[in-house]
């Protein structure tokens, strides 16, 4: 069983999923309002968003006393965060600016990918090997959307029997999408295009918030029970509380290299020939050059206009 990394508003903690009744370890303490969290295992980096400080920050696994600001301007409520471990990019949602943005892992070369028809975007999940990203929106028209990680091919994949879609996670091996709905109190799954939808845990969960997966087990945080729960990803059976008495459980991830499988990085050689951003794409050549917001991409599709 994995270590589970979770945000707890005032700190980030790690707990062993097999021994969850034991105390967690504080990885980064003394925070204001940590909400979303993710990591790049191969780089030894942990990222989190702080919604009070309106910032995204990072630290190194083994140097957690040293915290770096990654994005500190233009954020209002960065509720969702995801690291592209292949393309080495950072993606985030902001439910107040109603944007989904991307940048390099250090926060440079920032680009707004989506800013229209977003109401309350929250969880975001990436599948860099296929070039797709997924996000939940619990606004007036709740939905789950999918798009290319380059901002292309945006499509609503779930928009029925959905109210407060909070948690979202991907099963890379089985090619499935899992999500938790805090109003309808369930966990459902579907194919990555939204077809073949099935219930995993039917309407019995008090207030599921964030969701992750490791091997055959789903793990999620619950706001009502202040705990981390788990069940079998196929059947929903074996539902149990594995870590309780959490101050304010927010985002959660299975903290393991297994959750960030290696694959061919189409941007790996010479940044794909791109002068600035090289973003994963679902269509050949499986990457797309892009420019920071406000800077134009030249007709060669590789170079950003001078002054970027």
């Amino acid at each position: 069983a994995p270590l589970l990394l979770y945000a707890n508003r005032r700190d980030l903690r790690l707990v062993d999923a097999t021994n969850g009744k034991e105390n967690a370890t504080i990885v980064v303490g003394g925070l204001e309002d940590a909400a979303a969290v993710d990591f790049v295992f191969s780089h030894g980096l942990i990222y989190w968003s702080d919604v009070s400080e309106e910032a995204i920050k990072r630290t190194e696994f083994n140097k957690t006393e040293s915290v770096q600001n990654v994005v500190v301007s233009g954020l209002l409520s960065p509720d969702g965060l995801a690291c592209d471990w292949l393309g080495e990019k950072l993606y985030w949602t902001d439910s107040e600016t109603n944007r989904i943005e991307v940048s390099n892992l250090d926060g440079s070369l920032r680009k707004v990918l989506f800013w229209q028809e977003l109401d309350q975007p929250r969880a975001i999940a990436l599948d860099p090997s296929s070039g797709f990203m997924y996000w939940t929106d619990w606004g007036e028209v709740p939905k789950i959307e999918r798009a290319g990680m380059d901002g292309s091919s945006r499509f609503i994949i779930i928009n029925s029997e959905i109210y407060w879609p909070n948690g979202l996670t991907l099963d890379y091996e089985e090619q499935k999408l899992y999500w938790a709905d805090a109003k309808l109190n369930f966990i459902h799954k579907s194919n990555l295009d939204g077809t073949n939808r099935q219930a995993v845990v039917k309407g019995s969960l008090p207030h599921p918030f964030a969701l992750t997966l490791f091997e055959d087990i789903l793990y999620w945080t619950d706001w009502s029970t202040h705990s981390i729960l788990a069940c079998n990803k196929y059947t929903g059976e074996g539902l149990r509380e594995i870590h309780s008495d959490i101050f304010s459980p927010m985002d959660i991830h299975a903290f393991s290299q297994q959750r960030q499988p290696n694959a061919t990085n189409p941007c790996g050689i010479d940044n794909g020939g791109c002068s600035h951003l090289c973003l994963m794409s679902p269509v050949k050549p499986f990457y797309q050059c892009a420019c920071p917001t406000g800077v134009k991409l030249l007709e060669n599709g590789k170079t950003c206009k001078d002054g970027a």
Epitope: D11, N23, A24, T25, I26, V28, G29, G30, L31, T64, E65, S66, V67, H226, D245, F247
Partner: antibody, heavy 118, light 105 residues
Framework: QVQLQQSGPELVKPGASVRISCKAS????????IHWLKQRPGQGLEWIGW????????KYNAKFKGKATLTADKSSSTAYMQLSSLTSEDSAVYFC???????????WGQGSALTVSS | QIVLTQSPAIMSASPGEKVTISCSAN?????MFWYQQKPGSSPKPLIY???NLASGVPARFSGSGSGTSYSLTISSMEAEDAATYYC?????????FGGGTKLEI
């Protein structure tokens, strides 16, 4: 075993400053919050604030901002509280306490008595 | 800030008697903590997160409650339980304590 050893009693003049220490032993100092609390004679407890020694982030009760400054020295596993511009209202016993991972104060220092008098 | 009001302020109980101390918050809190303090000593944790017994605390102590109303119960008073008891919340900053209940034998 876990211990928090505080510095001894202090008698200081009004307007002066004082630094109280809290030396931790028996656990990993950098991975637990240290809180500071005030107790005036015959009265209840007041929470001053916390410090997380791992990255020395702090949080203060607004009432004590400008009065108390919390610091920590990782090399000696010691937390400090500096109190400035002292008045008779600051005369009290000050406690440091470790926050257990279930968010309560599981180990306390023995208390440091501060008397402010001319 | 959240104000915690303990009642009674002072009480006495005979050995073997059941004792209940109340703690009322001026707005709803998720959990309550209880500490025991004897004269000249540091406070000692009794109950965490409303109803969990801290390490080494005798089973005669228990906690309950929710929202704005919480209580600490000693099922059978013993001489060593004579002390001052404080409730505490961390629901919002600043973390606050009740004024204390002095329990005499």
């Amino acid at each position: 075993q876990v211990q928090l050893q505080q510095s001894g009693p202090e008698l200081v003049k009004p307007g002066a400053s004082v630094r109280i220490s809290c030396k931790a032993s028996g656990y990993t100092f950098t991975t637990y919050y240290i809180h500071w609390l005030k107790q005036r004679p015959g009265q209840g407890l007041e929470w001053i604030g916390w410090i997380f020694p791992g990255n020395v982030n702090t949080k203060y009760n607004a009432k004590f901002k400008g009065k108390a400054t919390l610091t920590a020295d990782k090399s000696s596993s010691t937390a400090y509280m500096q109190l400035s511009s002292l008045t008779s209202e600051d005369s009290a016993v000050y406690f440091c306490a470790r926050e257990e991972l279930q968010y309560y104060f599981d180990y306390w220092g023995q208390g440091s008595a501060l008397t402010v008098s001319s | 800030q959240i104000v915690l009001t303990q009642s009674p302020a002072i009480m006495s109980a005979s050995p073997g008697e059941k004792v209940t101390i109340s703690c009322s918050a001026n707005s709803s809190v998720r959990f309550m903590f209880w500490y025991q303090q004897k004269p000249g000593s540091s406070p000692k944790p009794l109950i965490y997160r409303t109803s969990n017994l801290a390490s080494g605390v005798p089973a005669r102590f228990s906690g309950s409650g929710s929202g704005t109303s919480y209580s600490l119960t000693i099922s059978s008073m013993e001489a060593e339980d004579a002390a001052t008891y404080y409730c505490q919340q961390y629901h919002s900053y600043p973390w606050t304590f009740g004024g204390g209940t002095k329990l005499e034998i």
